[in-house]
Structures are given as C-alpha cells and as structure tokens.
C-alpha cells in the first residue's frame, strides 16, 4: 500500500471513466488511470480506502491501466483517485473522479411550466417530483450546454430557467438523489420547444436518441448549482 512521503515528486496521473461517470445499478464501468510508461504499479482508491491495484506487465510499455468494476452499486459509487509508482517514488494523487450510480428505488416525474412549447423570452420552470423522500434533485439536459442543475428538496424541486433562449431547447430529464452519488431512475424525458424570434424554428435537437449515453455533464457543482463544462462519455479530470 502506498505510503506518503516527502518525496512525492512524480506528476499526478489522469483518471477517467468509460463509458461514463453515470452508471446504471448493476452495470459495469471501466476506470482508467494514466501515469507514466515507467510506472511499475497503479493503485486505485475509493473514498480514501485502497480499492485495487494493477502492476503493468514489463512487456507492455503502456502508460495507463484499466480498473474494471463489474457491477456498479451504491457501495461502489463515490469518489475515486489513483496513484502510480515509478522506481521508489509515488505520484501525487489524481484529481477526484466522481462516479454516480443511477436506477435506484424510484422514478421521478418531470414537467415544465407553463408548457413544453414556449415563445422565445418566455419564463419557464421545470418541476421534478419524487414520491420517495430525497435530499437533492438533479436536472440534466441531453446533448446540450453541458450544464446540470441541482436543488434541495424533500419530494419536489423547481428549476426556474428564466426567460428562455434557443440554447434552452432540447430534452431534459431529472433524478432524485439519495446521496450525491446514488440517484433514482431517470424521469421520462421532457422536450422543450422554443418558437418565435428571427428564425422561427420549434425544432428540438435532431438526434432521435434519448439515451443517457448522450448526455454531457460534470458532477463538480459550484454554489449556484450550475456545473462546469465537461464531456460525459469520456469523463477525464485533469489540471
């Protein structure tokens, strides 16, 4: 097991998850850790505890390893970090990777006020309701601005969007969370259509899919609840 020393001089590795950082309960996920070609061992930590290790075969000069989680559950959802060793030295810790498990317990209802088809500039609010008491709700937009919002609430939360622009159009879903990394099933999708304005188009995004695989977001919330942009499919944390 890695021992902290003053000589932690190697650069920190990069950590990411594929196919995504949001994993349906019972599904598998790969956590990749990229360090150096000279690395003799990689260690993966989960919530601060030693989780797994890999010693790359000398014949394969690869600078990354894959850790496989065969069945994602609420027990494996949380914050992961990795380290690597080269010679006698250990690297600094990677940035945290936040893995979320979805598909737990219940399915929320999502609706939009005043209606799903609105005029440019009209005020719009999304409502998310979950019968099971929860601590926080998340609203996600597919393929959109890469933003996710969260609101605290017991069984219902509202997400005021303000005067809408064309950037707001698209398909939304919401989740209730039992903790930051254990989420409900997704709601049914709600598509927001925007009409009016210079180019009168009420088209939603043309991509026909409503699969979670196409969502783009990052789970490091700021105080306002909005998130920084980050690719969903290939979620890499790196500074």
């Amino acid at each position: 097991q890695r021992i902290n020393t003053e000589k932690e001089t190697l650069p920190k590795p990069i950590i990411w998850a594929k196919p995504s950082i949001m994993v349906t309960n019972g599904n598998s996920v790969n956590i990749w850790c990229q360090g150096a070609q000279s690395a003799s061992e990689y260690q993966l930590y989960f919530e601060g505890s030693f989780f797994a290790l890999e010693r790359p075969k000398p014949s394969r000069s690869m600078n990354k390893v894959r850790f496989f989680i065969s069945q994602m559950t609420s027990h494996t959802a949380g914050i992961y970090t990795c380290f690597y060793q080269s010679g006698e030295l250990w690297s600094k810790s990677s940035n945290p990777l936040k893995l979320v498990v979805t598909g737990l317990y219940d399915t929320p209802n999502l609706w939009v006020y005043p209606r799903p088809e609105v005029t440019l500039g009209e005020n719009v609010t999304f409502f998310c309701q979950l019968k099971t008491a929860t601590s926080k709700f998340f609203l996600l937009k597919e393929r959109g601005s890469n933003h996710i919002q969260n609101k605290y609430g017991n069984i219902q939360a509202e997400f005021p969007m303000g005067p809408v622009t064309r950037a707001h159009r698209g398909t939304y879903r919401c989740f209730g969370s039992y903790n930051d990394y254990a989420w409900s099933f997704p709601s049914e999708p709600v598509t927001l259509l925007i009409t009016g304005g210079v180019e009168n188009s009420s088209l939603a995004p043309t991509d026909p899919t409503s699969s979670l695989d196409y969502w783009e977001f990052d789970l490091s919330t700021n105080e306002s609840g909005l998130q920084k942009d980050s690719a969903f499919w290939d979620h890499t944390t790196q500074n």
Epitope: N30, F46, S49, F50, F51, A52, L53, E54, R55, P56, K57, V65, R66, F67, F68, I69, S70, Q71, T73, H75, T76
Partner: nanobody
Framework: EVQLVESGGGEVQPGGSLRLSCAAS????????MGWFRQAPGKEREFVAA???????YYADSVKGRFTISRDNAKNTVYLQMSSLRAEDTAVYYC????????????????????WGQGTLVTVKP
Amino acid sequence: EVQLVESGGGEVQPGGSLRLSCAASGRTFASAAMGWFRQAPGKEREFVAAISRSDDTYYADSVKGRFTISRDNAKNTVYLQMSSLRAEDTAVYYCAAVVPTYGNNIYVHSAAYNYWGQGTLVTVKP
C-alpha cells in the same frame, strides 16, 4: 451465477498450518479475480489476500510472509495456505470473486467483489 464454497477450516495450535480451499462453480473462473477476507468475532470484515486472473498477488501486511494465495484454473479453485498461525488469525474466512474482470486487476476493497462464499471458521488456540 457463480457459487463459492470454502473448506479446510478448523482448529489449530499457534504456529500451525492450514490450507483453505474455495471451489467455484461455472466456467467463468479463469476470468475472475479472487480474494480472501476474514471476520473475527466483534470485528469488521478485513482483507487478507487477493490474486488476479494472471496470478499476480497482494497481501495484507498482517499476513505477508505467512500466508500464500494461489489458484488452479483447471480445478476452478483458489487456495489460501496459512502458516505460522497466531491467535489473532482466528476468524471466519470468506472467499470472494470479481466476475468478470480485466487484465491484471487485484481487488483489495470488499465493495469490488460481487460473489461471496459462506465462510469457513479458523480457530487458533493452544
């Protein structure tokens, strides 16, 4: 579905040896990473040793040099050879598997394992 059945537990004197076996059902054994955990009375389950599907091993500091984990893919069995046993080794020993797994992964955390045996009791006393 994978089933794990441990055997080989029993009572032994301090300094003695035992070999635990864990037989796995199914044809997925060669693609599984395996581990041994133990739980002493009134204590939490703790990691003992693990082996990757390519025979790379890792041990808890408390058993390093005394215990050896190995596997026989032809027999679908993983072993824990325990020697120089001490009173503090008294516990129920559990075999666990990660199925499937990838490459040379060795799993140390119990949350990683998706299949568990029922356990076998090892008692070390004079």
